[in-house]
């Protein structure tokens, strides 16, 4: 069964800047990745970025840089300043859509310690 992993890290240089990394562990080819915060998309979450392998990347503040790391993983850097900046307990969710298999989603937040956290 495919799985999604989510890793949230706070940047040491900018304490209110976050890096979210997500990956898809499965055999299907990815058609779309949606990153949201505050919960899953459609369940109170707000979309931060949508990444399509062919048609490009769309991102919304406070997302600063969304990119593909591999064919099945992405990363997203969030701006640290402003009213819409995330806090330490913010939940981030990644949804990977693969055709014709379907969608898989996982959420994660900053781990209690300062070490990078991994949740699936």
């Amino acid at each position: 069964t495919p799985e999604v992993w989510v890793q949230v890290r706070m940047e040491a240089t900018e304490l209110s800047s976050f890096t979210i990394r997500c990956g898809f562990l499965g055999s299907g080819s990815i058609s779309l990745v949606t990153v949201s915060w505050g919960g899953p998309n459609g369940a109170g979450g707000t979309t931060l970025a949508v990444l399509h392998p062919e048609r490009g990347i769309r991102q919304w503040a406070p997302a600063r840089q969304a990119r593909w790391e591999t064919q099945s993983s992405i990363s997203l850097i969030l701006e640290g300043s402003g009213a819409s900046s995330p806090c330490a307990n913010t939940t981030f969710c990644c949804k990977f859509a693969s055709f014709p298999e379907g969608s898989w989603e996982a959420c994660g937040s900053l781990p209690p310690s300062s070490d990078p956290g991994l949740s699936a």
């Epitope: 779309l32 062919e54 949804k95």
Partner: antibody
Amino acid sequence: DVKLVESGGGLVKLGGSLKLSCAASGFTFSSYHMSWIRQTPEKRLELVAAINSNGINTYYLDTVKGRFTISRDNAKNTLYLQMSSLKSEDTALYYCARHEDYYGFAMDYWGQGTSVTVSS
Amino acid sequence: SIVMTQTPKFLLVSAGDRVTITCKASQSVTNDVAWYQQKPGQSPKLLMYYVSNHYTGVPDRFIGSGYGTDFTFTISTVQAEDLAVYFCQQAYRSPWTFGGGTKLEIK
């Protein structure tokens, strides 16, 4: 203007074969996932077979596995459904449809349908 | 496979009425639900995607809501041209599955 035009339907004997075609125009065919959906005489909709944009990944409804083959020719902008060992329950109106990644794989364009009647 | 149970099967309403159709998934499909309209003699047409997003040109009297397993589709003010069969569909997990349809008839 996006257009999907099905052809190849007709009256066929029990156990016979038929090949349906769907000619696509007005969009970059090779960038979209495609499906065959049938509507039974009782008006129920069933997704019979699906194929991803590059033709590598496919899906089949359990009841047609081993009898139907979905394929595509991206150079000819055409989707196919080869049907063999036809059964009476395959009698239906067959539609081809385009899936839109950005709409959660919803089918944003459908053809007008081609009728398949399996008789004994 | 995920079963989409759609109710009611038939609706007899007057123009101007508010109608609601429900769709219940046998397991969570998050927000991967679309709604289609099929007018007599025509192929299905996409109305809503991701539960509540209107497809291009779809009037805002059509309203979708829900998340997880329970979904509703509402026509706030029914018009004569809304005579059709309406289907819900999940695209969360293969195989994509449809509800049984709701036939809307105008008095």
